[in-house]
């Protein structure tokens, strides 16, 4: 729990450099996100494909989309879960991180120092050991997050099943109902290829209790979709006289010393025809 208060932002006096004053874990061990670069990567043959169970949500069901002042969050059902980790991890919510229209590079994790346009996090909790995500969030092995790197490219109809509701959650505290859809459609191709490491929540209280799975391959959304995400939302309540745009809601990469990130894929460079001369 924070030492006092719970106000934090991505910019200004309450920005990430100040998080550790109120949330000590933010200045502690195993912090996320990180840069994924070749020196720290190690292939691990035991990292088998994950199975995504109960991800196909019925459109007859309603799911709550919320502007929490930091991101846009979609509540997920507890019978949606990942199979293939040491315990069952049940879904609790997904949310996104992004940049701004002038610098649309707002992913949290970077690859070889490069940001992607945005990043999706699907948060799960260890439901074998804990009754809910809140209880699990500060416990060892408590959380497992799937991270999807998002790049600008072609229109993505699956992501639009979230983005089409953004106008109803423009301000902090606003909530809307979203019809269920297949959450697996938000994942990239070849989900068997991923990075794995132990880290933390990327927002306060920054608990170092997250088993991260960052998929190697990005998904694409269109420039228009990205712009909608970057311009639709505010961090402030509707009646706030000083509205703040919800932009650049990503944490800087953290130190990652004397540790490894494990990959489910071997780092084989594909030779192109041009590279053979």
């Amino acid at each position: 729990a924070p030492v006092n208060g719970s106000k934090w932002t991505y910019f200004g006096p309450d920005g990430e450099n100040s998080w550790s004053k109120k949330y000590p874990s933010c200045g502690g061990l195993l912090q996320s996100p990180i840069d994924l670069h070749s020196d720290i990567l190690q292939y691990d043959a035991s990292l088998t494909p994950l199975e995504f169970q109960g991800y196909n949500l019925s459109a007859n069901k309603q799911f709550l989309l919320t502007n929490n002042g930091h991101s846009v969050k979609l509540n997920l059902p507890s019978d949606m879960h990942i199979q293939g980790l040491q315990s069952r991890y049940s879904a609790t919510q997904l949310h996104l991180h992004w940049g701004n229209p002038n610098d649309p590079h707002g992913s949290e994790h970077t690859v070889s120092g490069q940001h992607f346009a945005a990043e999706l996090h699907i948060v799960h909790y260890n439901s074998d050991l804990y009754p809910d995500a809140s209880t699990a969030s500060n416990k060892s092995e408590g959380l497992a997050v799937l991270a999807v790197l998002i790049e600008m490219g072609s229109f993505n109809p699956s992501y639009d099943k979230i983005f089409s509701h953004l106008q109803h959650v423009k301000y902090k505290g606003q909530e809307a109902f979203v019809p269920g859809f297949n959450i697996e459609e938000l994942l990239p191709e070849r989900t068997a290829e991923y990075y794995r490491y132990r880290g933390s929540l990327t927002t306060p209280p920054c608990n170092p209790t997250v088993l991260w799975t960052v998929f190697r391959n990005p998904v694409q959304i269109s420039q228009e979709q990205l712009l909608a995400l970057e311009t639709a939302l505010y961090c402030t309540h509707m009646d706030d006289p000083s509205p703040r745009e919800m932009i650049n809601n990503f944490r800087q990469v953290q130190k990652f010393d004397e540790r490894l990130v494990y990959t489910s894929f071997s780092q084989v460079q594909v030779c192109t025809a041009a590279g053979l001369s």
Partner: antibody
């Protein structure tokens, strides 16, 4: 035939609690959420909350959070609404209802007959 | 919360009259739904997605509108249409209903 049947209404003392039941039949119970909606005498309709019978996940109207609890017994195809600290203003007909998706959003296609709760000393 | 204001609250009309009920939302909504309720009975779905009639609803009923302003129209009022009509939005949490419009016999 798809049916929802409420029961459990009656006279309750102020400060007391109620537990209403909503028994469903005629469809695959876990495929649809169950909503509770109430209607005070001569007034409009007000949503209380809903439950997903497949997993017991609940969502409430903020107005009723902490005072209303919705639960489910899948083996009986029955949802329950418990409300505590009742006041005269909670006097209403309580309906359960099922929303169906039609391609963009939902509408309530099936309603129970309603059960009247009167809060009075 | 999105407030839904129906007007008029009640109206008296004769059989054969054209009747229009308005529902105004305090913020923009994607679709409006309408329900019909008769005394002592549960509401019945009547119009969904602003303009689609529920199966069995006579074609003299129609719905239209967008954004914040929506209407339900009965082109030629029939005796069985005397009831209370409620609008409802599902765009934002909490989902909300209008206060109702009672259509009475003149």
């Amino acid at each position: 035939e798809v049916q929802l049947v409420e029961s459990g209404g009656g006279l309750v003392q102020p400060g007391g609690s109620l537990r209403l039941s909503c028994a469903a039949s005629g469809y695959s119970y876990t495929d649809y959420n169950i909503y509770w909606v109430r209607q005070a005498p001569g007034k409009g309709l007000e949503w209380v909350g809903y439950i997903d019978p497949a997993n017991g996940d609940t969502t409430y109207n903020q107005k009723f959070k902490g005072r209303a609890t919705i639960s489910v017994d899948k083996s009986k195809n029955t949802a329950y609404l418990q409300m505590n600290s009742l006041r005269a203003e909670d006097t209403a007909v309580y309906y359960c209802s099922r929303p169906i998706y039609y391609g963009a959003y939902w509408y309530f296609d099936v309603w129970g007959q309603g059960t009247l709760v009167t809060v009075s000393s | 919360d999105i407030q839904m204001t129906q007007s008029p609250s009640s109206l008296s009309a004769s059989v054969g009259d054209r009747v229009t009920i308005t529902c105004r939302a305090s913020s923009s909504v994607t679709y409006m739904h309408w329900y019909q309720q008769k005394p002592g009975k549960a509401p019945k779905p009547w119009i969904y997605a602003t303009s689609s009639l529920v199966s069995g609803v006579p074609s003299r009923f129609s719905g239209s509108g967008s954004g914040t302003d929506f209407t339900l129209t009965i082109s030629s009022l029939q005796p069985e249409d005397f009831a209370t009509y409620y609008c409802q939005q599902w765009s934002s949490n909490p989902l909300t209903f209008g206060q109702g419009t009672k259509v009475e016999i003149k």
